[in-house]
Amino acid sequence: PEPPTACREKQYLINSQCCSLCQPGQKLVSDCTEFTETECLPCGESEFLDTWNRETHCHQHKYCDPNLGLRVQQKGTSETDTICTCEEGWHCTSEACESCVLHRSCSPGFGVKQIATGVSDTICEPCPVGFFSNVSSAFEKCHPWTSCETKDLVVQQAGTNKTDVVCGPQDRLRA
C-alpha cells in the first residue's frame, strides 16, 4: 500500500507512517513503528502538557513568586498550568499575572466606584454635589452630606466634595 501523506486527527506522520499523538498530561518517549504503538509517559510532578502532542519534555508549572506578591489561585495538574493571582490588597500588572502592584486609593474628594480585584485596580469617581470623601481609601464610597433639616438644625457651613456640611442650631427670634 501507498505510504500516507496525511494522518487522522490526533495522529502525526513520521517515517511515512501515522502515529498516535500523546494525550494531554503525557509526553512522547518513542514514536510508533510498524509493530509498536507510540510510547508516552505521564508528566512528572510540577509539569504539564495541555494539548495532544509529540513533545519529548513536559512544561514546568508556572511559579507564583511570593516575592512578587503572587500566590496560587489554581494548582496546576498534569494537563493544566498553575494559575497565579495576587495577595490581598494587590492586583496583577498584566493579563498573564506575572507580578502585582498595590491597589490604588481614592484621594479625598473621590470615592470608590469599584473595589479592586485580583486582576483589576480600584476605580475612583469624583464625589458629586451632595456627597463627600475626606479620606484616602481603597474601599470608601462618597458619603452623602448630613441632612441638617432632619435633625431640626440649619446649615452653618456648606459642604464640599471633601467635607461634610456643618449643622448648627436655628437662630431663636428675640422678643
Epitope: 486527527e9 490526533k10 494531554p24 502538557l49 495541555d50 494539548t51 495532544w52 512544561h59 489554581q74 496546576g76 493544566t80 498550568d81 498553575t82 494559575i83 498584566s94 493579563e95 498573564a96 499575572c97 486582576v119
Partner: nanobody, 126 residues
C-alpha cells in the same frame, strides 16, 4: 462565563486582505490560548490558526501558512487574524475560540477549546 464577538468579515476579491477581530468579555483570558477555526458550506470545521500565551507561540494550518497571521492585544482582550492573498477556497464562516484558564498552549483540535464565538462570514470572489 466568556463571551466572544467576531467582526471584520465580508466580501473581498481574490488576492485581497481582511482582518478579523475577536473581542472577549466576561473573564480575562490572558492565561489562555486562543484560536481561529473555519467551516465552509458542506464541510467539516477545520483549524486555521492558534496563539499561545507562553511567548506567544503560534500554529497555522498548512493551507494558510505564510498568508494568515494571528496576534493578540491582551490590553483589549482581543485576538486578530490578518488574512492576506485570499483565495476563493478561504470562503467560510470563521469562528474564534478560547481555551480555559490554565491552558496556555496553542492547540489545533476543536475539543481542546472551551469557549466559542458565533462566527463571521468571509466570502472570497474570483
Amino acid at each position: 462565563q466568556v463571551q466572544l464577538q467576531e467582526s471584520g468579515g465580508g466580501l473581498v476579491q481574490a488576492g485581497g486582505s481582511l482582518r478579523l477581530s475577536c473581542a472577549a468579555s466576561g473573564r480575562t483570558f490572558g492565561r489562555s490560548a486562543m484560536g481561529w477555526f473555519r467551516q465552509a458550506p458542506g464541510k467539516e470545521r477545520e483549524f486555521v490558526a492558534a496563539i499561545g500565551t507562553r511567548g506567544g507561540s503560534t500554529k497555522y494550518a498548512d493551507s494558510v501558512k505564510g498568508r494568515f497571521t494571528i496576534s493578540t492585544d491582551n490590553a483589549k482582550n482581543t485576538v486578530y487574524l490578518q488574512m492576506d492573498s485570499l483565495k476563493p477556497e478561504d470562503t467560510a464562516v470563521y469562528r474564534c475560540a478560547v481555551r480555559g484558564p490554565g491552558y496556555p498552549s496553542a492547540a489545533i483540535f476543536q475539543d481542546e477549546y472551551h469557549y466559542w464565538g458565533q462566527g463571521t462570514q468571509v466570502t472570497v470572489s474570483s
